[in-house]
Amino acid sequence: QAGPLPKPTLWAEPGSVISWGNSVTIWCQGTLEAREYRLDKEESPAPWDRQNPLEPKNKARFSIPSMTEDYAGRYRCYYRSPVGWSQPSDPLELVMTGAYSKPTLSALPSPLVTSGKSVTLLCQSRSPMDTFLLIKERAAHPLLHLRSEHGAQQHQAEFPMSPVTSVHGGTYRCFSSHGFSHYLLSHPSDPLELIVSGSLEDPRPSPTRSVSTAAGPEDQPLMPTGSVPHSGLRRHWE
């Protein structure tokens, strides 16, 4: 008896974080023996959608022409082969931005920081929210969460960073969200450019320069609890 069918791979193009009204394509890649692909959405009747495979049968396309709140959520896909259904894929979290008005992002005491010192990025929303997110452009894991302390809804969240080093330099944005749906985010804040100047440091060239320039907990002041596969959405809760 053969073992269970390998799980398919699920991903979204152009990405898993989509602005309201934009199109997104969800891809499910299985094996050449696949006869049918099924996409399930958490808390929706299953299957959410079914598709025949595209030649050479190892993947299927699920199209969302215009992103709305209804499409935001957690997805898994399966494929059917002559011997039955596969294991589920790792989850894909499809996030919609533009659900709420944009917050304001600022740096305290200043966006110009000396290496070896500290900075606190402050994300402020007009209406009270319970989750705030900080992203850094071109980061390996672009989204990071900070839940307001004490579980209460608040107008702001602080993202402390220390010690600041050259990897912290770059463009940041923040989002706000309500706890009842982490898949619905505000419009992004205006960008904040963090400039790291001068240094007390001993710079040393390295062939193993980290690729996760803003992904790691050293570079983002958040408590890591793991990452969500294939979504680029990494959850960090306080």
Epitope: G116, S118, P160, P163, L200, S210, S212, G216, D219
Partner: antibody
């Protein structure tokens, strides 16, 4: 479970050298900056050195600058502290600690003892 | 360098008491103030980071407050395991510096 375990301490003569190691487990080592902190007998804690994630940046306390070299091997999840020109005032328990990115050290090892004496 | 001062080097208290340990920085450290507990066997544990945020797994009887240069750690309803030495540390500017420590002893 996050763990950091120091090793390599011992008795060394003034002017001598010693290399401390710190083995990390339970987290993605390459994602975190790391520190060395020491504590002399009956004294408080003293920060010694810090290395950033990508080995791009290293900082040292003035008391050890030019004598100690901090490095890391992300492939082996290991942190090092090469200590040279050791002095009696370097006698201490040396702790390896993980940086939390917010100015704190969130997990510490049990420490390794370094004694500099003739 | 930023100097950190814990004026009380030792403190006696009884089980169930509420105690406050103070720490002063020589300049504004913008809330980048952390508290550690060191047990007699040398084990060091982070309790509070960024002035008031409780590190994971730390009991809620520990709390922190302060701003600018003055900070404090409060332990309410003291338990036997809380008798230890407490250090503050500034993480605002390298070199990071620690207070001299406050030893909490049983009365």
């Amino acid at each position: 479970e996050v763990q950091v375990v120091e090793s390599g301490g011992g008795l060394v003569k003034p002017g001598g050298s010693l290399k401390l190691s710190c083995a990390a487990s339970g987290f993605t080592f390459s994602d975190y900056g790391m520190h060395w902190v020491r504590q002399a007998p009956e004294k408080g804690l003293e920060w010694v050195a810090y290395i950033s994630t990508g080995i791009i940046t290293v900082y040292y306390a003035d008391t050890v600058k030019g004598r100690f070299t901090m490095s890391r091997d992300n492939a082996k999840n290991t942190l090092f502290l090469q200590m040279t020109s050791l002095r009696s005032e370097d006698t201490a328990i040396y702790y390896c600690a993980r940086a939390d990115g917010r100015g704190a050290m969130d997990y510490w090892g049990q420490g390794t003892s370094v004694i500099v004496s003739s | 360098d930023i100097q950190m001062t814990q004026t009380t080097s030792s403190l006696s208290a009884s089980l169930g008491d509420r105690v406050t340990i103070s720490c002063r920085a020589s300049q504004d450290i913008s809330n980048f103030l952390n508290w550690y507990q060191q047990k007699p066997d040398g084990t060091v544990t982070l309790l509070i980071y960024y002035t008031s945020r409780l590190h994971s797994g730390v009991p809620s009887r520990f709390s922190g407050s302060g701003s600018g240069t003055d900070y404090s750690l409060t332990i309410s309803n003291l338990e036997q395991e809380d008798f230890a030495t407490y250090f503050c540390q500034q993480g605002n500017t390298l070199p990071w510096t620690f207070g001299g420590g406050t030893k909490l002893e049983i009365k």
